[in-house]
Every structure is written in structure tokens, then in C-alpha cells.
């Protein structure tokens, strides 16, 4: 069978090979389409120019005034010329509809490097067959599930027209130190060949690079955190970031009920002050960042290192 592609809504003429160009003709068309139950026979005598359905023209061709999805199928003609020679024609008709230009909706104006971001949703309306949507970065195809690229797709069919609406949501994780203004576009590729792709207008979001966090430093005085009973320990939390973050203190993994401050003073150390201390810096743009932990211990006079179970001390430290 000869393959024919016809655009929905357009007229279609199928030639009946071997048929005399003018009446009278001995020919018969057989159709098996979405409009017919099994094979339907059409003769040259049926139908009129005023009809909006398939009919045989005076030259023996089959005419469909406006092709629809229901007209997909097989069309056969059997004709006999004036000398009695029989000729058969066989067509396989497929229909298509080019959608409107695809669009990117809900597009992001800014992306953050190093984390997944929704770039936008590409929408194509009114295609048949469905076709496909694909994304491009700086003109090159983006491959889903590679290098931080993910795509969520959805296909819907219009209940009356039978035409398709496609949606494709793009998520990317921009690399740190990459292009600060990448160009994204989306294109629709038709389900039937020989039709060029339709591309959206490009979008160019900015890529925002978060400043890498420098480590929060915890400085202990005296060094090593070992102190004689009744002595004083000063803990200083140093954060290079600007503006200065809020500093909270932890002991043995539990927050200390103290107002924020970069310095914690433990005067007149007693056994209850012994433990593991750390500070937590909270930035407005990032999450909390914890320092390394240091161990505070009491040493008896004459001892080289810390000893447990020492007595004395005043309890909770004070803030400078």
C-alpha cells in the first residue's frame, strides 16, 4: 500500500489508477477507516458536491473534503478501463496536525548552583499524533537522568477533537562555576516524519552561586581545654562570613539556654562544667553550621592531664 499523510482539516484526493478520466466509469472504492464498520463501498454515483463526506469525483478519484482522525485507515480502488483491463490502487492514510508553537511557562528567572532547580514547563497544544517534547541547553539536547537533568512529562488528549496536549517540566542542577546565563529552549518533534521541529523562544535564567561556607572555628583558652578547678575557660567561635551570623552554644549535643554570642566564658570551673562543647553559626542564606567539638576537663594540681570526678565549680558559664 502507498503511504499517504494528510493534515487534519485539509482536503484529500486519492487517485484511482487505471480509471477513465471522464464518466462513465466502472470502478469501486472500498474504505476501512475509523468511520466505517469493516469495509464500506463507495460508487461514483453516490454523493454530491454539497456533501461533506468522502465521495467519488467525476474523474474516479476519491475526495475527502476535510480529513479527520477518523479517516485514518485503508483505501482501495478497483477500476476497469474502456478495454476491460483491471487496475487496483491501495492507500494507507495517516493524518497529522501540527500544534501551535510550544511555550515555556512558569519559567525560573534565577537558578541556584549545586542544587536541583525547576527551569520551567514546556507546553505544546493541538498535535496529532502526540509527538515529543525535548529540551536544549545552549542549542544542545539535554538528556534526562544525566548530569543533574530530570524531566517530568504529561500527555493529555482532548475529549472532542482527539488532539494532544504535551507538558514537560525540566529540573536541572547547575554546576558550580558554570555558565552564569545558560540558554534553555524546548522543541516539539512531530510524531509523523517529514515535518520540522517547532522550537520555543529561549529563556535565560541567571545562575546564583552560593558563597562556599568557610569553616566555623572554635578557639579554646587555655589551649587543649584542660583547666584546674576554679579556673576559667574562654570559648571563642570565629566565623569569617559577613554579615556576622548568630552564634549558639551546645554542650554534649544539647543547646545551652543562653542568648546568642560569639564568646562563651566558663568561670570557676567545676565538675559540672566538664563535657564536649561546640558552637553553631546560623546564617540567613544558608542553614546552621556547627563547629568542631572540644572537650573541657578539670585537672588536679600536679596532674598532666584531665581527671574525672573533680569537685567544685560554679556551674553555668557566662557570656562575654
Amino acid at each position: 500500500a502507498q503511504n499517504i499523510t494528510a493534515r487534519i482539516g485539509e482536503p484529500l484526493v486519492l487517485k484511482c489508477k487505471g480509471a477513465p478520466k471522464k464518466p462513465p466509469q466502472r470502478l469501486e472504492w472500498k474504505l476501512n477507516t475509523g468511520r466505517t464498520e469493516a469495509w464500506k463501498v463507495l460508487s461514483p454515483q453516490g454523493g454530491g458536491p454539497w456533501d461533506s463526506v468522502a465521495r467519488v469525483l467525476p474523474n474516479g478519484s476519491l475526495f475527502l473534503p476535510a480529513v479527520g482522525i477518523q479517516d485514518e485507515g485503508i483505501f482501495r480502488c478497483q477500476a476497469m478501463n474502456r478495454n476491460g483491463k483491471e487496475t487496483k490502487s491501495n492507500y494507507r492514510v495517516r493524518v497529522y496536525q501540527i500544534p501551535g508553537k510550544p511555550e515555556i511557562v512558569d519559567s525560573a528567572s534565577e537558578l541556584t548552583a549545586g542544587v536541583p532547580n525547576k527551569v520551567g514547563t514546556c507546553v505544546s497544544e493541538g498535535s496529532y499524533p502526540a509527538g515529543t517534547l525535548s529540551w536544549h541547553l545552549d542549542g544542545k539536547p539535554l538528556v534526562p537522568n544525566e548530569k543533574g537533568v530530570s524531566v517530568k512529562e504529561q500527555t493529555r488528549r482532548h475529549p472532542e477533537t482527539g488532539l494532544f496536549t504535551l507538558q514537560s517540566e525540566l529540573m536541572v542542577t547547575p554546576a558550580r562555576g558554570g555558565d552564569p546565563r545558560p540558554t534553555f529552549s524546548c522543541s516539539f518533534s512531530p510524531g509523523l516524519p517529514r515535518h520540522r521541529a517547532l522550537r520555543t523562544a529561549p529563556i535565560q535564567p541567571r545562575v546564583w552561586e552560593p558563597v562556599p561556607l568557610e569553616e566555623v572555628q572554635l578557639v579554646v583558652e587555655p589551649e587543649g581545654g584542660a583547666v584546674a578547678p576554679g579556673g576559667t575557660v574562654t570559648l571563642t567561635c570565629e566565623v569569617p562570613a559577613q554579615p556576622s551570623p548568630q552564634i549558639h552554644w551546645m554542650k554534649d549535643g544539647v543547646p545551652l539556654p543562653l542568648p546568642p554570642s560569639p564568646v562563651l566564658i566558663l568561670p570557676e570551673i567545676g565538675p559540672q562544667d566538664q563535657g564536649t562543647y561546640s558552637c553553631v553559626a546560623t546564617h540567613s542564606s544558608h542553614g546552621p553550621q556547627e563547629s568542631r567539638a572540644v572537650s573541657i576537663s578539670i585537672i588536679e594540681p600536679g596532674e598532666e592531664g584531665p581527671t574525672a570526678g573533680s569537685v567544685g565549680g560554679s556551674g553555668l558559664g557566662t557570656l562575654a
Epitope: 461514483p44 454515483q45 453516490g46 454523493g47 454530491g48 458536491p49 454539497w50 469525483l57 467525476p58
Partner: antibody
Framework: QVQLQQSGAELAKPGASVKMSCKAS????????MHWVKQRPGQGLYWIGY????????EYNQKFKDKATLTADKSSSTAYMQLSSLTSEDSAVYYC??????????WGQGTSVTVSS | DVVLTQTPLSLPVNIGDQASISCKST???????????LDWYLQKPGQSPQLLIY???DRFSGVPDRFSGSGSGTDFTLTISRVEAEDLGVYYC?????????FGSGTKLEIK
């Protein structure tokens, strides 16, 4: 050869109905649609409507929608037209004519209808 | 409705003369299928109409070649190259491009 033999002349009273026939021969009756045309004495031709004898589907000129009813009997290869609620305006010759898919090619000899009280 | 206007209403001719009848339509009769559905009929006195020309210019079987049709769109002409006595009667143009189908008002061909 193609022949369309129409029934004889009708004389009817105002308000009455008449049913005329058109017997086809020389071709396959169900393959061709049958049209009907009116011609008043000394006047032109007016299309009434057509019937597809294969399916019984009909299409009428709006001007004749309430006047004419077209039917067909496949077994006898005969098309019929009934005219109702006759008035003097319906006095005319009525032709059946075969539709070939692109033109009307053969006509019956006509049935004369006279409406008179 | 499509109105077909024929001119002249009456055409007196001599036998052997050429005769031309015009038919003008209020709408184009060119169908989306590429064909133009305009036909010509002759109704001889006391007879049924008979088909002469279909699809503007195609002669029906048995019609002498002195009859020819021409035109396109909305303007059409029937020409009889050499009129013979048997050609007398009323000529009608007819359109089947759209419903309702309509006929021209007729042109009477008569001897001078």
C-alpha cells in the same frame, strides 16, 4: 437503457394529498440517488429534493420541506413523492431525475398534477 | 441560495447561425474538489429536460459536437455553433455545487 417511468396525471382537490411514482429500469436502482423537480405551466424548473434509495436518506429544499415526502421501495425499484395539503400553487408537472454523482443525467417523462375544486 | 441569471430570455436565430447563451451565478461554482458543477439542459416543447453539457464543458453521450460549454467561477456560456431546427426549445443552466440545487430561469431559442 436507462428509463424512468412516472405514474399518470393526477387531479386533486385543495387540501388533499397525492402520491406519484417513478419506476426505474436499465440500471441498479440503489446505486443512484433520485431527485425530484417541479415545473409550473410555462415556468422554470425548481428542485424539490432527493432520496438515496439505498439508505432512505432524504434532503429537501426548505421551500418544499412541509409539502413533499420522498420514499423509495428497493424491491420494486420505485421512488415515490407524496404532496400534501394541496393548493392551486401545487398544480405543475413533477419530474423524477437520476443523479449520476456529478449531474442529473436522465429524467422521467413527468407527472402532471392539477389541483382544482 | 445560489441564483443563476440567464441572458437573453429569448434568442431568435436563423438556422445555421451561431447562438450563445450566458449564465451568471451569484456564487462561485468551483468546488473544493476542483470541479465546477454547472450543467446545461435543453427542454424541447412537450418533453422532459435532456442533459447536454455537464461540468461546464463536457458533452453528454449522444450530444452533437455543435454544442459546447465554457466559463469558470461565476460566468458560463453555452454555444451552439450552427443551429438546427431540432435545437429549438428552452435551455436551462443548473448548479449542483451547493444545496438547494438551482436552475437558471431559461432561455427560449426560436426561429427568427
Amino acid at each position: 437503457q436507462v428509463q424512468l417511468q412516472q405514474s399518470g396525471a393526477e387531479l386533486a382537490k385543495p387540501g388533499a394529498s397525492v402520491k406519484m411514482s417513478c419506476k426505474a429500469s436499465g440500471y441498479t436502482f440503489t446505486t443512484y440517488w433520485m431527485h425530484w423537480v417541479k415545473q409550473r405551466p410555462g415556468q422554470g424548473l425548481y428542485w424539490i429534493g432527493y432520496i438515496n434509495p439505498s439508505t432512505g436518506y432524504t434532503e429537501y429544499n426548505q421551500k418544499f420541506k412541509d409539502k413533499a415526502t420522498l420514499t423509495a421501495d428497493k424491491s420494486s425499484s420505485t421512488a415515490y413523492m407524496q404532496l400534501s395539503s394541496l393548493t392551486s400553487e401545487d398544480s405543475a408537472v413533477y419530474y423524477c431525475a437520476r443523479w449520476a454523482g456529478y449531474t442529473i443525467d436522465y429524467w422521467g417523462q413527468g407527472t402532471s398534477v392539477t389541483v382544482s375544486s | 441560495d445560489v441564483v443563476l441569471t440567464q441572458t437573453p430570455l429569448s434568442l431568435p436565430v436563423n438556422i445555421g447561425d451561431q447562438a450563445s447563451i450566458s449564465c451568471k451565478s451569484t456564487k462561485s461554482l468551483l468546488n473544493s474538489d476542483g470541479f465546477t458543477y454547472l450543467d446545461w439542459y435543453l427542454q424541447k416543447p412537450g418533453q422532459s429536460p435532456q442533459l447536454l453539457i455537464y461540468l461546464v464543458s463536457d458533452r453528454f453521450s449522444g450530444v452533437p459536437d455543435r454544442f459546447s460549454g465554457s466559463g469558470s467561477g461565476t460566468d458560463f456560456t453555452l454555444t451552439i455553433s450552427r443551429v438546427e431546427a431540432e435545437d429549438l426549445g428552452v435551455y436551462y443552466c443548473f448548479q449542483s455545487n451547493s444545496l438547494p440545487l438551482t436552475f437558471g430561469s431559461g432561455t427560449k431559442l426560436e426561429i427568427k
